[in-house]
């Protein structure tokens, strides 16, 4: 992941806003706050952007190379199964869950893991890069 | 420094309309998502709407949804907040607010404008 | 919606005054919670940011702790000019919800 312009003014990064990192055509930021569910995804919208769709295992391989052992909020929910915010299905990776109620997706260095939504966690946004 | 100079209030009827404008300045506008924030005597100070950076999605509480539209020119440094079919309970100091970037709700705030909805 | 809940509503106290606020979410917010100031025919200003962080030119004798449900803001030495209404503000999650407000007055 290439950070931004507040991190570094190398030429070979540019093209992300101030607190966002690229990696390949889009730029993504990840949070020091936490929110809830419904509010991390208000947060990328105001920003005009998206909750994190991951696209394919090599970009969630990556995404978690960066993230710790603290869980962030990614776009993803369970309505009938696992789906992300654009009606996508979750089908290149499982995830953890150990109840009903926990419909909301949230990622680590290790997992996809499902928590209630209303858990205040750190989130992750993603965009097209300008 | 940041500066927020809202304008547009004044006495309306029930039911009628009024356009409220924010003036911003001293930092790059098209960087921050917006908000209106309303302050009543009775209920304090309660969020009304949000736009984003570039003003393609707003974001309202379900009691002024439909009646309050939120909007911004990005090359005018301006938000504004329409209010449509007014009520009584609508009568607050409206200001305009900045989000901080890192999602810590609104850094900055306006004055603020008054608006009164009275027969 | 969560419910903030300020208390005291108002309180008087003399210049040198320590003087504690304390807040309550009706859920757990973690550190997601705001303080501001408002004088009178002011706009609320933003003191304290996610429960303990100052803004700058906020004196540090205003300071703020507390996380999950219950919150606090010190002012360990009260000045003239630090009487005013104080408010609470979550912003774990959506709607932002204020407290009602607490007065700081002169004695």
């Known amino acids: 992941l290439c950070q931004g312009s507040k991190y570094s003014t190398c030429a070979s990064c540019p093209s992300c806003p101030d607190h966002w990192m690229k990696y390949g055509n889009h730029c993504y930021y990840f949070s020091v706050e936490k929110k809830d569910w419904i509010s991390s995804l208000e947060f990328c919208l105001a920003r005009d952007s998206h909750l994190l769709m991951i696209t394919d295992k090599q970009e969630m391989s990556l995404l978690q190379d960066f993230l710790s052992e603290a869980f962030h909020w990614v776009g993803l929910r369970n309505n009938s199964g696992w789906r992300w915010e654009d009606g996508s299905p979750l089908n290149f990776s499982r995830i953890y869950s150990n109840s009903l109620v926990q419909t909301c997706g949230a990622i680590n260095k290790n997992s996809l893991q499902a928590s209630s939504c209303e858990v205040s966690l750190q989130w992750v946004c993603k965009k097209v890069s300008p | 420094q940041v500066q927020l100079v809202e304008s547009g209030g004044g006495l309306v009827k029930p039911g009628g309309s009024l356009r409220l404008s924010c003036a911003a300045s001293g930092f790059t506008f098209r960087n921050y998502a917006m908000s209106w924030i309303r302050q009543t005597p009775g209920k304090g100070l309660e969020w009304v709407a949000t736009i984003s950076e570039s003003g393609n999605y707003n974001n309202y509480p379900d009691n002024v949804k439909g009646r309050l539209t939120i909007s911004r020119d990005n090359a005018k440094n301006s938000l504004y907040l329409q209010m449509n079919s007014l009520k009584a309970e609508d009568t607050a100091v409206y200001y305009c607010?900045?989000?901080?970037?890192?999602?810590?709700?609104?850094?900055?705030w306006g004055q603020g404008t008054t608006v009164t909805v009275s027969s | 919606d969560i419910q903030m809940t300020q208390s005291p509503s108002s309180l008087s106290a003399s210049v040198g005054d320590r003087v504690t606020i304390t807040c309550r979410a009706s859920r757990d917010i973690g550190s997601s919670l705001n303080w501001y100031q408002q004088k009178p025919g002011g706009a609320p200003k933003r003191l304290i940011y996610?429960?303990?962080s100052l803004d700058s030119g906020v004196p540090k004798r205003f300071s703020g702790s507390g996380s999950g449900t219950d919150f606090t803001l010190t002012i360990s030495s009260l000045q003239s000019e630090d009487f005013a209404t104080y408010y609470c503000?979550?912003?774990?999650?959506?709607?932002?919800?204020f407290g009602q407000g607490t007065k700081v007055e002169i004695k």
């Open positions: 503000l979550q912003y774990a999650s959506s709607p932002w919800t």
């Open positions: 996610a429960t303990s």
């Open positions: 607010v900045r989000d901080d970037w890192e999602g810590r709700a609104m850094d900055y």
